[in-house]
């Protein structure tokens, strides 16, 4: 019952242009180009998009016109390969142009950069932004798409259209408000934070598909959709999983027009069949397309049916377990995952996948044994330690978070992770540990039943950031091992790492701990990052430093910054007091 079986179209580009409409077509082509050629100037991309759009219009008028029968990858790839400065700007990526489709597109994908060397986006004054918005609304919004897409090359394109719509609405409303800044800035902050979270979540989906394959993604989707739609039948969930997998496979492989089109079809299907899917979809389905798709993706879990029987009957006690498993292994395991997940909205998806893996391993072993039933009879007992491990970890860390508050909790994680993987670059350790630390504010406020899905699935997203950043410049075998061995065991793998005893401490460099008056004008967040960067460097110099030693040094450092920022001659204070601080810190840490 796949919703995506369409007749073959004479012209794929005309088909997508008609389905999506000119505005969405242009926006999606811009996103696609910016995600591939992340260093190209805005004007160059706009020119390429306009050329593609004009070509698409000729194909809409006559699908038999020259080149209209070419695949989108061929058309887009040919267009990207016309960029004059390709080799100078992108180096070996230019070699992709010597290949033909589909190999060329795969080559382009491989050169997407998760951490492009681009300047940080600085927000101009509100009046400057409002003037730019009023002067040329279309260019202003295109620029937003371009800047986000090039910095987040795996951002979920149809969702970026939704963010752009909200961005436009914020400026439309706030630029006419009495206090423009008070109206606009909180909205932009929210969009920025939501956007970063959305990007990271999608990056995990793409990593799952690209590094672990479709089966891994489908297993994740079965578990998550079964928790969300526990009243839906297995066949319905399977159909949604198949369609959702197609959508994400397309977006993750740069097929953004197909992805957006198929996502719209999926939303339409879900809303037309909500009676057999979930009672929570009504409000979502009344919204316009972009809001509808976003709303469905975020919809709360439906209530569990009241009369669900014990799982043991079908999956442990039945004499047909091995027969059913042998007949269709993935279907039977899918049913197990569906049944377990719909009964456990209180478990993280990754825990559910670990349980399913344990069940699979047990059946593989037991169905070849002399007495299979005797062999797998106690399989559910094997689940207990797997369930308790994340429960205990979350309990301990939420207690620590409540005791320390977010900033100091982040610092505890910074120290913990720097000791585990000290070879990782300091900016990556700071970024990842800060994000890991946000799990406290995000999840510890929840009741017990919601803590684990919130915390462990969020940690999976953050650890994937570490994995993709590390993959670009691998420096630690331990990180590589945890990132590549098992998608669902990444978090337990990192949790289990102890201090790296093989690490040779970094040479002490006073320059790393030299600060200037500019720190005084930084925002609180930026000041925290400076201090956390220093903390990571300290641990890299002295991995065996105790918590107490590090705390003493960090307290001295905070006092030093506060004192010098109040001084009349700030720069002199930083120079003189800084030397004393470095000497005192070296003494305290025995450096």
């Amino acid at each position: 019952r796949g919703v995506f079986r369409r007749d073959a179209h004479k012209s794929e580009v005309a088909h997508r242009f008609k389905d999506l409409g000119e505005e969405n077509f242009k926006a999606l082509v811009l996103i696609a180009f910016a995600q591939y050629l992340q260093q190209c100037p805005f004007e160059d991309h706009v020119k390429l998009v306009n050329e593609v759009t004009e070509f698409a219009k000729t194909c809409v008028a006559d699908e038999s016109a020259e080149n209209c029968d070419k695949s989108l990858h061929t058309l887009f790839g040919d267009k990207l390969c016309t960029v004059a400065t390709l080799r100078e700007t992108y180096g070996e990526m230019a070699d992709c142009c010597a290949k033909q489709e589909p190999e060329r597109n795969e080559c382009f994908l491989q050169h997407k950069d998760d951490n492009p060397n681009l300047p940080r986006l600085v927000r101009p004054e509100v009046d400057v932004m409002c003037t730019a918005f009023h002067d040329n609304e279309e260019t202003f919004l295109k620029k937003y798409l371009y800047e986000i897409a090039r910095r987040h090359p795996y951002f979920y394109a149809p969702e970026l259209l939704f963010f752009a719509k909200r961005y436009k609405a914020a400026f439309t409303e706030c630029c006419q408000a009495a206090d423009k800044a008070a109206c606009l800035l909180p909205k932009l902050d929210e969009l920025r934070d939501e956007g970063k979270a959305s990007s990271a979540k999608q990056r995990l989906k793409c990593a799952s598909l690209q590094k672990f394959g479709e089966r891994a993604f489908k297993a994740w989707a079965v578990a998550r959709l079964s928790q969300r739609f526990p009243k839906a039948e297995f066949a319905e969930v399977s159909k949604l999983v198949t369609d959702l997998t197609k959508v994400h496979t397309e977006c993750c492989h740069g097929d953004l027009l197909e992805c957006a089109d198929d996502r719209a079809d999926l939303a339409k299907y879900i809303c037309e069949n909500q009676d057999s899917i979930s009672s929570k979809l009504k409000e979502c389905c009344e919204k316009p397309l972009l809001e509808k798709s976003h709303c469905i993706a975020e919809v709360e879990n439906d209530e569990m049916p009241a009369d669900l029987p014990s799982l043991a009957a079908d999956f442990v006690e039945s004499k047909d377990v091995c027969k059913n498993y042998a007949e269709a292994k993935d279907v039977f395991l899918g049913m197990f995952l569906y049944e377990y997940a719909r009964r456990h909205p209180d478990y993280s998806v990754v825990l559910l996948l670990r349980l399913a893996k344990t069940y699979e391993t047990t059946l593989e072993k037991c169905c070849a044994a002399a007495d299979p039933h005797e062999c797998y009879a106690k399989v559910f007992d094997e689940f207990k330690p797997l369930v308790e491990e994340p429960q205990n970890l979350i309990k301990q860390n939420c207690e620590l978070f409540e005791q320390l508050g977010e900033y100091k909790f982040q610092n505890a994680l910074l120290v913990r992770y720097t000791k585990k993987v000290p070879q990782v670059s300091t900016p990556t350790l700071v970024e990842v540990s800060r994000n890991l630390g946000k799990v406290g504010s995000k999840c510890c406020k929840h009741p017990e039943a919601k803590r684990m899905p919130c915390a462990e699935d969020y940690l999976s997203v953050v650890l994937n950031q570490l994995c993709v950043l590390h993959e670009k410049t691998p420096v630690s075998d331990r990180v590589t091992k945890c990132c590549t061995e098992s998608l669902v065991n990444r978090r337990p793998c990192f949790s289990a790492l102890e201090v790296d005893e093989t690490y040779v401490p970094k040479e002490f460099n006073a320059e790393t701990f030299t600060f200037h008056a500019d720190i005084c004008t930084l925002s609180e967040k930026e000041r925290q990052i400076k201090k956390q960067t220093a903390l990571v460097e300290l641990v890299k110099h002295k991995p065996k430093a105790t918590k107490e030693q590090l705390k003493a040094v960090m307290d001295d450092f905070a006092a030093f910054v506060e004192k010098c920022c109040k001084a009349d001659d700030k720069e002199t204070c930083f120079a003189e007091e800084g030397k004393k601080l470095v000497a005192a810190s070296q003494a305290a840490l025995g450096l």
Epitope: S71, L72, H73, T74, C96, K99, E101, P102, E103, R104, N105, E106, C107, Q110, L209, Q210, K211, F212, G213, E214, K246, T249, E250, H253, D255, E258
Partner: nanobody
């Protein structure tokens, strides 16, 4: 660790059809393709397919007669060969890329013979 195993080859009469299969293991989703090598000739590109199956490409000599497809759930690649000709006789190889569009992983091959 990466394994590609072809099957489905055999003897077929001119004008007949065959369906080749390739089972892949130890490999995430990649662009995949079919190549062939006739006795005493260079290896020749037959067809390739993108991960999502959206994009396919064919060698000039097989266009309109052969169809490449894949089933990612089964990690399988297929080649449906219709209107076979004697010049299609060759060992057919399944191949997968390294993720950068370069074919690095190869199967052992399956023999296809078109003869009356």
């Amino acid at each position: 660790q990466v394994q590609l195993v072809e099957s489905g080859g055999g003897l077929v009469q001119p004008g007949g059809s065959l369906r080749l299969s390739c089972a892949a293991s130890g490999l995430p989703s990649r662009v995949m393709g079919w190549f062939r090598q006739a006795a005493g000739k260079e290896r020749e590109f037959v067809a390739s397919i993108s991960v999502s199956g959206i994009d396919t490409r064919y060698g000039d000599s097989v266009k309109g007669r052969f169809t490449i497809s894949r089933d990612n759930t089964k990690s399988s690649l297929y080649l449906q060969m219709n209107s076979l000709k004697p010049e299609d006789t060759a060992v057919y190889y399944c191949a997968a890329t390294d993720g950068q569009g370069n074919y690095r992983h190869w199967g052992q091959g399956t023999q296809v013979t078109v003869s009356s």
